[in-house]
């Protein structure tokens, strides 16, 4: 189920790459975030908290990513026209409960000016 389009700027372009921003509520302590391209899982990141509030970050499908207190950024490099597609942030919230899955996304348009190494 698609809950809706992202209500924020999801794609940030720089240096022939794109940062895909996946937000989550900053109250959330334990979650899994997956980046989907169409229906395919490109990347994922799971944050859990153990005893003594020790934080564990795991990735089964590793991408260059960056975690903040309310977002996960996934980075795609060497953009070309094949990257144009629908991208979705698939968030699974574990803690605090209730367990909740949301899918938000948008279409990544690729323009010549955003392609990697276009002047080379």
């Amino acid at each position: 189920e698609i809950n809706g389009s992202a209500n924020y700027e999801m794609f940030i372009f720089h240096n022939g790459g794109v940062q895909i921003l996946c937000k989550y509520p900053d109250i959330v302590q334990q979650f899994k975030m997956q980046l989907l391209k169409g229906g395919q899982i490109l990347c994922d990141l799971t944050k859990t908290k153990g005893s003594g509030n020790t934080v564990s970050i795991k990735s089964l499908k590793f991408c260059h990513s960056q975690l903040s207190n309310n977002s996960v950024s996934f980075f795609l490099y060497n953009l070309d026209h094949s990257h144009a597609n629908y991208y979705f942030c698939n968030l699974s919230i574990f803690d605090p409960p209730p367990f909740k899955v949301t899918l938000t996304g948008g279409y990544l348009h690729i323009y010549e000016s955003q392609l990697c190494c276009q002047l080379k």
Epitope: N7, I27, N70, P96, P98, T102
Partner: antibody, heavy 121, light 106 residues
Framework: QVQLVQSGAEVKKPGSSVKVSCKAS????????MHWVRQAPGQGLEWMGL????????NYNQKFQGRVTITADKSTSTAYMELSSLRSEDTAVYYC??????????????WGQGTTVTVSS | ENVLTQSPAIMSASPGEKVTMTCSAS?????MHWYQQKSITSPKLWIY???KLASGVPGRFSGSGSGNSYSLTISSMEAEDVATYYC?????????FGGGTKLEIK
């Protein structure tokens, strides 16, 4: 139906502590987190903190840090909020509220009836 | 702390009149929720995720906005809408409520 029933009104002396209870029914207690919010007379609402029932993780508003303790007893489906070092400004109605999520954020979907705490010498 | 300023603080409307109240955030937020509180009762979830009506809320209510500015609108005021309405942001810690808009009927 889903219900949060809070303990009765309390009158406390300055410097003492109060412990307010919130008994949940109509749903699986550990499947939701519980927040506490207060409302001083004629004033707006103020978020105090929450507890994740299944993990016991707590998160407090820094304004109350050190004075507020939120706990839960899974066996009785009851959440508690204890506020210490009471002062007259803590006179308020205290509410528990169940945590829920929408597509973008979280909110309180069910509230208790409120517990009036009066701090007076 | 993200301060939410609601305006007007008090307003009155005639039955059938359109009503709009606003909530202005000192820092941008991703979404806003609204609660209705009638005198000496607990608040009730009224609108969540900026524009979604909570269960049982009449269709004459709507919510909109983005960034720093959000609003709650009643298309046609009814007597049962008399209450205080609070906006709430859960986007950034510490989570804050607006001071409320008290809606009365003329």
């Amino acid at each position: 139906q889903v219900q949060l029933v809070q303990s009765g009104a309390e009158v406390k002396k300055p410097g003492s502590s109060v412990k307010v209870s919130c008994k949940a029914s109509g749903y699986t207690f550990t499947d939701y987190a519980m927040h506490w919010v207060r409302q001083a007379p004629g004033q707006g609402l103020e978020w105090m903190g929450l507890i994740s029932i299944y993990s016991d993780h707590t998160n407090y508003n820094q304004k109350f840090q050190g004075r507020v303790t939120i706990t839960a007893d899974k066996s009785t489906s009851t959440a508690y909020m204890e506020l210490s070092s009471l002062r007259s400004e803590d006179t308020a109605v205290y509410y528990c509220g169940r945590n829920n999520y929408g597509n973008y954020g979280w909110y309180f979907d069910v509230w208790g009836q409120g517990t009036t705490v009066t701090v007076s010498s | 702390e993200n301060v939410l300023t609601q305006s007007p603080a008090i307003m009155s409307a005639s039955p059938g009149e359109k009503v709009t109240m606003t909530c202005s955030a000192s820092s941008s937020v991703s979404y806003m929720h609204w609660y209705q509180q009638k005198s000496i009762t607990s608040p009730k979830l009224w609108i969540y995720d900026t524009s979604k009506l909570a269960s049982g809320v009449p269709g004459r209510f709507s919510g909109s906005g983005s960034g720093n500015s959000y609003s709650l609108t009643i298309s046609s005021m009814e007597a049962e809408d008399v209450a205080t309405y609070y906006c709430f942001q859960g986007s950034g810690y510490p989570y804050t409520f607006g001071g409320g808009t008290k809606l009365e009927i003329k």
